[in-house]
Amino acid sequence: DIIMRPSCAPGWFYHKSNCYGYFRKLRNWSDAELECQSYGNGAHLASILSLKEASTIAEYISGYQRSQPIWIGLHDPQKRQQWQWIDGAMYLYRSWSGKSMGGNKHCAEMSSNNNFLTWSSNECNKRQHFLCKYRP
């Protein structure tokens, strides 16, 4: 049987049954999520569920820049350190950097400090790049 690889929207990249869009636009976390949703196809800020997925994403983003943190779909909506993925994925894989999780930092970003392989919490109203994801 011939299995056709699903195609992603122009400018998005494909990895293991998902499409990813890296947006170098400056948005706060909630606006970034809204913008992801506006692209349709069930897109949300990206969930990152394995080291392999994290590595693929990190390699792609490093081709554009290596200094700006990037919003992902992990947040702490109740502000109780109960983190969850906005797309409903199970919060099993974790890749937090050793930084403190304190303060008013309830949204997660891929940190540029470790080539985008680890996450940091940040204030959700900060404007920065973001990564969207959907399953085609």
């Epitope: 400018g11 869009g21 890296y22 947006f23 170098r24 636009k25 400056l26 948005r27 606006d31 809204l34 913008e35 506006s38 692209y39 554009y64 820049q65 290596r66 200094s67 700006q68 404007r127």
Partner: antibody
Framework: EVQLLESGGGLVQPGGSLRLSCAAS????????MSWVRQAPGKGLEWVSA????????YYADSVKGRFTISRDNSKNTLYLQMNSLRAEDTAVYYC????????????WGRGTMVTVSS | DIQLTQSPSSLSASVGDKVTIACRPS??????LAWYQQKPGKPPRLLIY???TLESGVPSRFSGSGSGTYFTLTISSLQPEDFATYYC?????????FGQGTRLEIK
């Protein structure tokens, strides 16, 4: 072909109001964030305001925050800028610009409409 | 806000010349830099984005390079239609900002 056509400019007294419109065609309007950028006579470019494709998110330069309101009507493919409490320093050509899909830069621009604030 | 300082402010050159315009951000930015061309009475036109990516339809004599706090726009062989004002723009930090412009005139 992408086209952006501004209208609504003119002469207004300080403290007055004006509403600019930008009619868009040649692309799926609701899929793109849009922006207003202005240029005072003989001066450089200054970003003024932006709005997401859905209209749910808006952004403003500090110089116009609280005085200007950006909005859009996706059913009419039209972008608006409501300008209140106008000042002499708001005198400029106002350009409607489409924000690039991946970056906060401007890939298409209208021809501009002149706003003059003077008594 | 990130300030962008362009140099020179104005430049006289002849058809066929190679010219370079510099743009210096007040703090380091990533690849989030664009260049625009503007002719009198016309809107700006996007030339280059992400430092060095040519916008569709822009002649290959235009090129961009740089990183951090120093970026350049180079025109390898000036054509009559290239005489205009050029602006850099950063979209690395909010709000987006423009340089003050470089006016390129015929010598």
């Amino acid at each position: 072909e992408v086209q952006l056509l501004e209208s609504g400019g003119g002469l207004v007294q300080p403290g007055g109001s004006l509403r600019l419109s930008c009619a868009a065609s040649g692309f799926t309007f609701s899929s793109y964030a849009m922006s207003w950028v202005r240029q005072a006579p003989g001066k450089g470019l200054e970003w003024v305001s932006a709005i997401s494709g859905s209209g749910g998110s808006t952004y403003y330069a500090d110089s116009v925050k609280g005085r200007f309101t950006i909005s859009r009507d996706n059913s009419k493919n039209t972008l608006y800028l409501q300008m209140n409490s106008l000042r002499a320093e708001d005198t400029a050509v106002y350009y409607c610009a489409r924000i690039h899909n991946w970056n906060d830069m401007f890939d298409y621009w209208g021809r501009g409409t002149m706003v003059t604030v003077s008594s | 806000d990130i300030q962008l300082t362009q140099s020179p402010s104005s430049l006289s050159a002849s058809v066929g010349d190679k010219v370079t315009i510099a743009c210096r951000p007040s703090q380091g930015i990533s690849s989030a830099l664009a260049w625009y061309q503007q002719k009198p009475g016309k809107p700006p036109r996007l030339l280059i984005y992400d430092v060095s990516t040519l916008e569709s339809g822009v002649p290959s004599r235009f090129s961009g390079s740089g990183s951090g706090t120093y970026f350049t726009l180079t025109i390898s062989s000036l054509q009559p239609e290239d005489f205009a004002t050029y602006y850099c723009q950063q979209f690395d930090n909010y709000p987006v900002t423009f340089g003050q412009g470089t006016r390129l005139e015929i010598k």
